[in-house]
Every structure is written in C-alpha cells, then in structure tokens.
C-alpha cells in the first residue's frame, strides 16, 4: 500500500531534485497545524502571522484583534492567556525551559478595558506556573514552589502554601519524575469548574536520592545540577492532595483529600485529578507496583468543610497480565449526571475500549468493541460521544474520529473522518469548542497535513484553517521517497512495518537497509503520518531503504502484544526487530552485507542490544542517549514494566538485560554511541557505563558526547549530530561522500 500519493505528475524528471541534509536541518519542509484556542461554543482566539491576537466568531463570521502585536512586543511576549471574563490577558515572556514540560517565565497582566498593564501588586518573577480560574479572573500561580491566589489581577496575593522549598517540597508543580512519567504536565493544580475550589498536589522529595551532573557552561568551574530523581527501587516522592476554597481561602485553609485505604497501605502514586462539579472531584491513585489503580470520587461536606471519599465511590482497575492502562492509566470523562463516566480500559478480549461506569466497574457497559483499540475520548455531550480509534480498515497506525449517538438506543456509531480526504488524511486528532458546538480536525497525514473547522451537529466542514499550500508548492520539485505500510505475520504475531524506499526504487536491485527503532512499551512507530525528516533524506538522496517495525510491547493492537514485554524488557523488542530484518532480506532487494540499526532513548537501548545480539545481521549501528541498565532509569517508568530490582522480585532480569552484559558481542560491529552530558532524563551515566564495559572488554567503538546538552540534543547540536550520523552510515554502507 503506497501511502504517500504522488503530488505532481512531472514527466521532466530532471527538474526534480533529491532532498538534502541541509533541507532537513533547516526545517525547509516543516508543516503547520491550526488548533483554535476556544473561548466559547462559537469563538476562538488565534495568533496571526503578524502576531496579533485575533478573536474569531464562527457564527457571525466576524473577527477582531483583541491584543495588538505592539502590546505583545512591548514586553517581548511569546505567549498569552485571556481571562474567562475577557477583562484581562496575561502576557508571558522570558521563557526559560526547565524539563520536558516545565519552564519559568515573567508574566504581565494587561487590562483590556483600559488598554493598560495592571500596576501595583505585580507578579513576582520568575513564575513557575500561572493560570486563570475557569470563570472570572482569579489567578493562581506558583512561585518558589509555593502557591498564591489573587482574587483580581491587581489585588495583593494570598499565600496558600508556605513549605515550598527547592528540590524538597513542590506545591502545585510536579517534581522531575511526576512531570516526566506520571502527569506529563508542568502543573499540579486544578481549578474546579466554576472556580470555587482549587486542588493541588504537594510532592515531598526530601528523602529522594539526587542525581548530580556537571554543567560546564563558560565559567572557570562547572556547576553541579542536582535533581531529586528516584531510580528503579529507590525512595519515591510522597504525594498529598489538598483542596482550598478560593472564595474564603483563610477560613479553613487547605483540606487534604483522603487516600483510599487499599492504596495507602503501601507505596503509591497519585496519577490524575478530574473535577466533576464544584463540589465533586475524582482522584486516581496507583500502587507502586503499577497493576492496581483506584479511581476515587470525593464529595464536599458542607457541614465539616472537608472532602469525603466513600468506599462505595471507589472503582478499582486491575491488570492480571501486565500493568494498569496503556502508557498511563486512562482518565474518566464524566456524564451529565455528574457521577457516571466513560473510560478506556481493557475488555475481556484484551483490547482497550470505551466503557461506561455507573455503580461499579463490574457492571460497566462496554461501548466500543472489536479487535482494534479506542485511543482517546475527546468529548461527551448530552447526545454524542466523540472518540478516536484505529478501527478503520484494520490499520493500527491510523487514527479516525468517531461519533457515537448516546442520546438514543441503540447508540449508533459514525466515522466522522474516514472518508473526508481518504488518500491524504488517515491520522487525525480533534479540538472541540464548548458543548462540542464546533470542532477542528487536524490531519497529520499521510499526505500534507491539513486543519479544518466543522459543525459539531452536522459534521459539515465550514472552512479550511490551514492547508500548508507553501509546503505543497515547495515539495513540487522534490523527489520524495515512497512509503508503504504493510505487515508481517510471524509465529502468531503481527509485525506492522513502514518502509521508506528511494524514489527510483527497483525491486530487482539491492539496497542498504537502515532500521529505525524506538520499541518502548506502549509506543507506536508505524503511523500513517506525514514527515520529511532525516530518514526521508537518507532514502531520497543516499538511496537507502529505511524500515520501522512495531514489535511486541508496542501499542494499540491489544494486550497480548502490549504486555508481552512485561517484566522482560530488552528481549522480545529486539527479537522482533531481528525477525523483521530476516523477512526483509527474504524480499530480495536488501543487500544483507549493508544493514544498520539506529535508535534514540529506548530506541538506543534496543539498537544496542540488537547490535550485540550475535546474529551477524547488522554491520553497524547508532545509539543516541540510550538506556543501558534499567537500574539507572526512573522508578515510575521502569517499575511499571519491570517490577522492582530486588531479589524477591525481578533483580535477575534487571541484571540480565543490561547493554554492558553484552559488551563482548560488539566486537564484530561498528558502534557509534552518542549522549548529551546534561541529560536529565536518561543520564549520561548510561553511556559512560557502556563505554567503560567496552573499554574493559577491549572492544573498539566510536563515541560522541554533546556538552551541556539534554535528552533532546537541540540547537546546533542537532545539526552536528545528524551530520555526524550521516557520515557514519555512509562510511558503513561504503557510499561516496
């Protein structure tokens, strides 16, 4: 199945050129998406090309600038946020990145009624997180790990917490491990729907071991970065959830929400908080051994001014074959009765599907079913439920948006996107306005991405928001590689793969093969999306065949495949890459003497193990920022899939699954090991240990470090990295420079 349709029929092949590495590094062929910043059922904000903030009304067709680029520029603002009462806008500047999601910034409040910045009781700087209440213009913000509340932007702040301390106590923001592995946000505070209450998490990292690494900078002495970072088996953060009445914050102060008894009996995590009404909140908790999750619905007790979480409102989700959920435990989407909800979890056949839960999980009504998976619930209204799945035509790497009419019986299902632009668009996400009056569809491919606006009642397309015309024109004279998505059936396992083929691909010829691997639990690499990236260049210009394979442990194809790697990371993911390579060789167009593998992060781990598999399949390979031992990685992530590194649990496999244990097997391959020295996520320690083991085994290898770079190897390092890797591969494949 050729997924990238030809865009132009040009008989003059000589006017077409191949992609260059410069094209990729300059981002020449990057695309744009359009996500409306919804502010009501029919209005949204969007930052125009000239940086004005424009309000669009879909129903009147009118638009006007609510904030000029001049005002934005006056404080060097790179972001904004309109208060729900539309009286104020916060302007964000001095953005300073911390970890994956977190950053600090300076905030200015602009008063739209008088066209001036609010003076007096200005916000401190730098702020770690700031947000408006959902109604009106109250402000909550986190400064120096403490939470503050303002009733109005010009008012003095009310300090909610006092115990915040750098690297010790975090209020309203997550610590490193919660940010990266549990919440996937920069915040840990949540307003109730009408802004009456504010819930927040407190993380106590006092007893967590610290990772320390040098940051070289430009000074005479490097500084040391210290991060409380629990590695597998180490002491974890202790979390508590509090709720404060924002109308009378000093009255009873923050009230702690009780933890379910079955959770509190041993180490546990808080996984998410969902407000249902102003006086009902839903908390999700997870045992440290992450196969038991408890969803707890708590009610405000007016008489006691406390939060009550009755046992009858605790719902347990347990996995007997793996961990709870997919990558994360799914979150509930509540119904209009404010007690029942929709949630995605495994059905009896081991596929993740939408269920409706009212009184108990045992009595759940299954809403979707089949040998495919429901992936995300976007919105539930009085009569419709919108969700995405990979059901259509049995391609796990697609995403289509569906609507189920839940206001009538039997509920009927309609695919909203399946036939809209079938060749161009097979991978969608959506963004809904209030009450799903309107929605935007964002198509990521396989053709050029396009964003469109739709009527939430009829699904009619209203207008195109972004169609990437400039990109389409720019690609007209580019010889893009061909892409196909197919599957291999091997020993009752389906291995989906994406193959990227040189433009003039000829099946009768032999090509070098590069495997690009990630392969982490609950990941998916074989997706029907558009991309012009480094591997596109390698196929287009350097004539390589590139393949991506989703093996055991990957997502959206059922629990059998997903949980196959449970407690056994580093085994089946590697086996399946090797199996696929053997199948590719059988296809007849692969030069079996020129096969390489590369990966980043988890992919670096898999590529290292594949190179050290002793199969003789791979001539060379690259590992960028690899994990080398699961004892070095974060507790929350690692233990989810591996259990604990203790004798009575899974220590044996922790030890057996290291890259270092296979040092001897690197002797007959060319290995390029790359890592950033300031990697807060997969610590440089991982590559340092690989290098040490290889040296001790007297195995030759190549290595590159990037000073002061984190897990993303961004900026100039990116250019250097891809140039370096290109040279390495061309040398390995004996391709002339």
């Amino acid at each position: 199945i050729v997924l990238r349709p030809p865009r132009v029929h040009n008989s003059e092949e000589n006017t077409m050129r191949a992609l260059t590495l410069k094209d990729i590094l300059n981002g020449t062929f990057s695309y744009k998406t359009f996500f409306p910043n919804w502010i009501s059922g029919q209005e949204y904000l969007h930052q125009s090309a000239d940086n004005n903030i424009v309000l669009y009304n879909i129903e009147t067709g009118q638009s006007y600038t609510i904030l000029s680029n001049r005002t934005m520029k006056s404080v060097n603002a790179s972001n904004y946020g309109l208060s729900p009462d539309r009286q104020f806008v916060y302007l964000e500047s001095d953005y300073s990145k911390l970890w994956r999601y977190s950053y600090t910034a300076t905030y200015y409040i602009y008063d739209l009624s008088n066209g001036e910045f609010v003076r007096g009781n200005e916000l401190p700087r730098p702020i770690q997180y700031l947000c408006w209440s959902p109604v009106g213009s109250k402000l909550a913000y986190v400064y120096q790990n403490n939470i503050y509340l303002k009733q109005r932007p010009g008012d003095p702040p009310f300090q909610i917490t006092f115990n915040g301390r750098e690297n010790k106590i975090f209020n309203g923001i997550p610590d490193w491990v919660y940010e990266e592995e549990m919440l996937a946000t920069k915040y840990a505070l949540w307003w109730s729907p009408n802004g009456k209450f504010l819930a927040y998490a407190e993380f106590n990292d006092t007893d967590i071991p610290v990772i320390a690494y040098s940051y070289y900078g430009d000074e005479q002495y490097p500084r040391t970065i210290n991060i409380p970072y629990p590695k597998a088996g180490a002491k974890n953060p202790f979390v508590r959830i509090f709720i404060i009445d924002t109308t009378y914050p000093a009255y009873v102060g923050p009230q702690e929400v009780p933890v379910p008894a079955m959770i509190a009996s041993s180490d546990y995590y808080f996984s998410w908080l969902t407000w249902v009404t102003d006086e009902r909140v839903c908390l999700q908790w997870l045992k440290r051994v992450q196969n038991v999750s408890v969803l707890s619905i708590c009610d405000f007790r007016e008489d006691w001014q406390t939060w009550d979480c009755p046992k009858t409102q605790e719902h347990i989700e347990e996995s007997r074959t793996g961990w709870a959920g997919g990558f994360f435990v799914s979150t509930p989407v509540f119904s209009y009765d404010a007690i029942s909800y929709y949630k995605i979890f495994s059905d009896k056949d081991g596929y993740k599907h939408i269920h409706y839960i009212k009184d108990t999980v045992e009595n759940a009504i299954q809403i979707t079913s089949g040998k495919w998976e429901a992936i995300n619930i976007f919105r539930v209204t009085q009569d419709s439920l919108f969700y995405s799945s990979n059901e259509f035509e049995d391609y796990p790497g697609r995403r289509n948006i569906y609507r189920i009419s839940i206001g009538s019986y039997p509920p009927s299902k309609k695919c909203v996107t399946c036939h809209l632009r079938k060749e161009r668009c097979q991978y969608y996400t959506a963004s809904f306005s209030d009450y799903a009056k309107y929605y935007a569809l964002v198509c990521y491919g396989p053709g050029i991405p396009i964003s469109t606006l739709h009527d939430g009642r009829t699904d009619q397309e209203i207008k195109i928001l972004e169609e990437n015309k400039e990109l389409e024109n720019a690609l007209k004279n580019i010889q893009l590689p061909k892409e196909e998505i197919k599957k291999l059936e091997v020993d009752e396992i389906t291995l989906w793969y994406k193959m990227i083929l040189p433009p003039q691909f000829d099946r009768s010829k032999k090509y070098p093969l590069l495997i690009q691997v990630y392969g982490g639990p609950c990941s998916q690499s074989v997706r029907s999306v558009f991309a012009v990236n480094w591997i596109s260049y390698l196929a287009s210009k350097e004539g390589m065949v590139i393949a991506l394979v989703d093996g055991r442990g990957t997502a959206f194809q059922g629990d059998k495949l997903l949980y196959a790697v449970y407690r056994k990371l580093g085994v089946y993911e590697v086996e399946d890459q090797i199996t696929a390579v053997r199948k590719f060789i059988e296809m007849g167009f692969i030069d079996e003497k020129r096969i390489a593998i590369w990966g980043w992060s988890y992919g670096g781990y898999v590529s290292s193990l594949a190179l050290a598999s002793g199969t003789g399949l791979f001539k060379c390979g690259i590992a960028v920022a690899p994990v080398s031992s699961w004892e070095y990685y974060a507790s929350v992530y690692t233990e989810r899939f591996m259990g604990l590194p203790t004798k009575d649990d899974n220590l044996e496999h922790y030890k057996n699954s290291t890259v270092m244990a296979r040092a001897e097997y690197f002797r007959n391959v060319d290995y390029l090991l790359i890592h950033g020295t300031a990697d807060d996520n997969v610590h440089f320690q991982n590559s340092a240990q690989i290098a040490k083991a290889l040296v001790n085994a007297q195995v030759d290898f190549q290595a590159m470090w990037y000073s002061d770079q984190n897990h993303g190897l961004s900026g100039l390092s990116t250019n250097h990295l891809y140039t370096h890797m290109t040279h390495f591969l061309k040398q390995c494949f004996s391709l002339s420079d």
Epitope: S340, T360, Q382
Partner: antibody, heavy 122, light 107 residues
Framework: EVQLLESGGGLVQPGGSLKLSCAAS????????MSWVRQAPGKGLEWIGE????????NYTPSLKDKFIISRDNAKNTLYLQMSKVRSEDTALYYC???????????????WGQGTTVTVSS | ELVMTQSPASLSASVGETVTITCRAS??????LAWYQQKQGKSPQLLVY???TLADGVPSRFSGSGSGTQYSLKINSLQPEDFGSYYC?????????FGGGTKLEIK
C-alpha cells in the same frame, strides 16, 4: 398504542414450574429493556429482574436468581419468565414492564401490562 | 442491595391540600430515582424519573426533589384522581428495589 399483555398465570403446586409470557405491541420491542415486577396480595411492588434488547445482559434480584429465568424472543415480540421451585410466597400478580432509554444508560418503566396472577397452593 | 424506606406508609389528605412523600435510600443513589402511582386494581404508572423529571403527560402539580439518599415527591393542590398508592424505585445498581409504598387516602 403501546400494549403489554401478560399470560400464563394460574394455579401451580409448591415445587412446580410455570412459564409466563408478555406479548408486546405498538412499539419497537427489540430496542427496549424489559422487566418483570410482582406484587403479592395487599403488598408493595418487588422488582424481579430485567433483560436488555439483545439478551446479552440479564439481571435478577439475588433471592430469585436461582429459580427464575428471564428471556425474550424479539422475532415474536415476546418476553418470558420461567418460574421453577415455586413456593407459597411466590403467589402474586406478575407484571411485565418496559420503557424508554434514559441518558445515560438506564431505562425507566414507562409501560406496564395489566398483570397475570400466579397462585401457589397445594 | 440498597434498601428504600418510604414514609409515611399511609396518609390522609383533602382535595386542594399539598402533600409530600419521602423516600430514603440506604446508600447514595445519585438521583437515579423514579416515582410511580398505582390506583386500586390498576398497573403502576410512571410519574417522575431522574428524581425530578416529570414523565410525559404527568400534571405539573407533581414534583420530585432530593439528592444523595433523601428524596421526596410533592403533590400540590390534590385532585380526586391523585388518591392511590405511590412507590419510589431506585435505578442506581441492581437489584432496582422499590420502597414499601405510601397509601394516599381521601380525608
């Protein structure tokens, strides 16, 4: 016009069996959840159980679970209640009831039959 | 199983009066409650569902209220046709038990 008509009641000896039927007309029977409810002489209403449109979900009141079986035949627009091991306390007027789907996912008993009497006596 | 306790068991009132019947659940039923009227020798008839929504064709003098475990049915300005028995029933979790009933008689 919606109609539910129960039949099959009568005199049955203790320990015996009986099958009640409920014929539906005037609505799309195959889309409705259906229930059986009974009322002992001079007493209140007691919910027996329910069945969903495609018979994949059947719920009973725990005390009657082992002696009563609810089933349906959508082709015949008929609901059934198979009673076994009956005792004198099963003497009652037996109603079938059905109703509208109420968002989210539950059903009220909007329509009731006139009932059929079951008398358990030796 | 949830127990529904209805009160009073019986009640005498005159035409034109206002009466209130209450129903207490042994656990939170989250407004999943229906009220029925049953006249002598007849089948029950649905009056209210979702604790407060009137069924089609039910006069507006009937109203339901409540939340959590406490619910009530109020009849304003009693009419002659309102006399009979009233039952509450929860729909929170199976079994969907009924209250014991309230017999409303003419004074």
């Amino acid at each position: 016009e919606v109609q539910l008509l129960e039949s099959g009641g009568g005199l049955v000896q203790p320990g015996g069996s009986l099958k009640l039927s409920c014929a539906a007309s005037g609505f799309d029977f195959s889309r409705y959840w259906m229930s059986w409810v009974r009322q002992a002489p001079g007493k209140g209403l007691e919910w027996i159980g329910e069945i969903n449109p495609d018979s994949s979900t059947i719920n009973y009141t725990p005390s009657l679970k082992d002696k009563f079986i609810i089933s349906r035949d959508n082709a015949k627009n008929t609901l059934y209640l198979q009673m076994s091991k009956v005792r004198s306390e099963d003497t009652a007027l037996y109603y079938c009831a059905g109703g509208y789907y109420r968002y989210p996912y539950y059903y009220t008993m909007d329509y009731w039959g006139q009932g059929t009497t079951v008398t358990v006596s030796s | 199983e949830l127990v529904m306790t209805q009160s009073p068991a019986s009640l005498s009132a005159s035409v034109g009066e206002t009466v209130t019947i209450t129903c207490r659940a042994s656990g939170n039923i989250h407004n999943y409650l229906a009220w029925y009227q049953q006249k002598q020798g007849k089948s029950p008839q649905l009056l209210v569902y979702n604790a407060k929504t009137l069924a089609d064709g039910v006069p507006s003098r009937f109203s339901g209220s409540g939340s959590g475990t406490q619910y009530s049915l109020k009849i304003n300005s009693l009419q002659p046709e309102d006399f009979g028995s009233y039952y509450c029933q929860h729909f929170w979790s199976t079994p969907y038990t009924f209250g014991g009933g309230t017999k409303l008689e003419i004074k």
